[in-house]
């Protein structure tokens, strides 16, 4: 696994930069984890046809994702940023139990999925302390979300492969939307 | 565990109707979908039709699109298709399949669970 932001060498041989900004930091994180999603989908997309074919194979999802929509403020047009810091908090607290599931389903990336799951857990920190209003911040409810992964768990070998496909895709495109807006704020 | 059993095949002339049924025994159905698969002789297993049985939405391959219905009876556990307008390309056996979970709903074969033991359905012209 790559080592943490803030832990490269580079850092260790320059001692006398100056020290990241609270944005800077966050960025740095996002872009770390998007490079684990990208190690994560690679073995994902080497393993079987699914990225190509999901488009085809499916007719229904169901598994409720987060994502970015207009109403939450994030996008150029319309761009409210307390209400977008709500929305990229709560949905990566919501994938936190997606991300639950990703353990134990990679071989070769076993620790990446575990970095990618700690990284989020250190970046919603982050930007708790960058929120003012944290009480409209609602976190998804233990018991549903052991409920839900008991159900991702029970499904046979091909639709647990097309889940977690569908669960780094979704995951990469709501961090690179959450960092295109946080570069706004 | 879940058992599904089809019935209602059998031979019909072009244009005719058949209605399929697929009843399942040891299954609530209360989350996975139903669908209906058919293979040809020489020819892989495709998808038919399915149904969710969260929302009841319903889809279908376009090749039936129009002439088949999908349908579903909660009380019967219970999946019915209703195939009008047959044509002689229709002749297939005609399998039913189960999913247990329901978050995703798909038209591939490896995305069920549970099959039945499938119905013949022959079209003459």
């Known amino acids: 696994a790559p080592v943490p932001p803030g832990e490269d060498s580079k850092d260790v041989a320059a001692p006398h930069r100056q020290p990241l900004t609270s944005s800077e930091r966050i960025d740095k994180q996002i872009r770390y984890i998007l490079d684990g999603i990208s190690a994560l989908r690679k073995e994902t997309c080497n393993k079987s046809n699914m990225c190509e074919s999901s488009k085809e194979a499916l007719a229904e999802n169901n598994l409720n994702l987060p994502k970015m929509a207009e109403k939450d403020g994030c996008f150029q047009s319309g761009f409210n940023e307390e209400t977008c810091l709500v929305k990229i908090i709560t949905g990566l607290l919501e994938f936190e139990v997606y991300l639950e599931y990703l353990q134990n389903r990679f071989e070769s990336s076993e620790e990446q999925a575990r970095a990618v799951q700690m990284s989020t857990k250190v970046l919603i920190q982050f930007l708790q302390k960058k929120a003012k209003n944290l009480d409209a911040i609602t976190t998804p409810d233990p018991t549903t979300n052991a409920s839900l992964l008991t159900k991702l768990q029970a499904q046979n070998q091909w639709l647990q492969d097309m889940t977690t496909h569908l669960i780094l895709r979704s995951f990469k495109e709501f961090l690179q939307s959450s960092l295109r807006a946080l570069r706004q704020m | 565990q879940v058992q599904l059993v089809e019935s209602g095949g059998g031979l019909v002339q072009a244009g005719g109707s058949l209605r399929l049924s697929c009843a399942a025994s040891g299954r609530t159905f209360s989350n996975g979908p139903m669908a209906w698969f058919r293979q040809a002789p020489g020819k892989e297993r495709e998808f038919v039709s399915a149904i969710s049985w969260r929302t009841g939405t319903t889809y279908y391959a376009d090749s039936v699109k129009g002439r088949f219905t999908i349908s579903r009876d909660n009380a019967k556990n219970t999946v019915y298709l209703q195939m009008n307008s047959l044509k002689p390309e229709d002749t297939a056996v005609y399998y039913c399949?189960?999913?247990?979970?329901?978050?995703?709903?798909?038209?591939?074969?490896?995305?069920?669970?549970?099959w039945g033991q499938g119905t013949q359905v022959t079209v003459s012209s």
């Open positions: 399949a189960a999913e247990r979970v329901g978050l995703l709903l798909a038209v591939v074969a490896e995305g069920y669970d549970y």
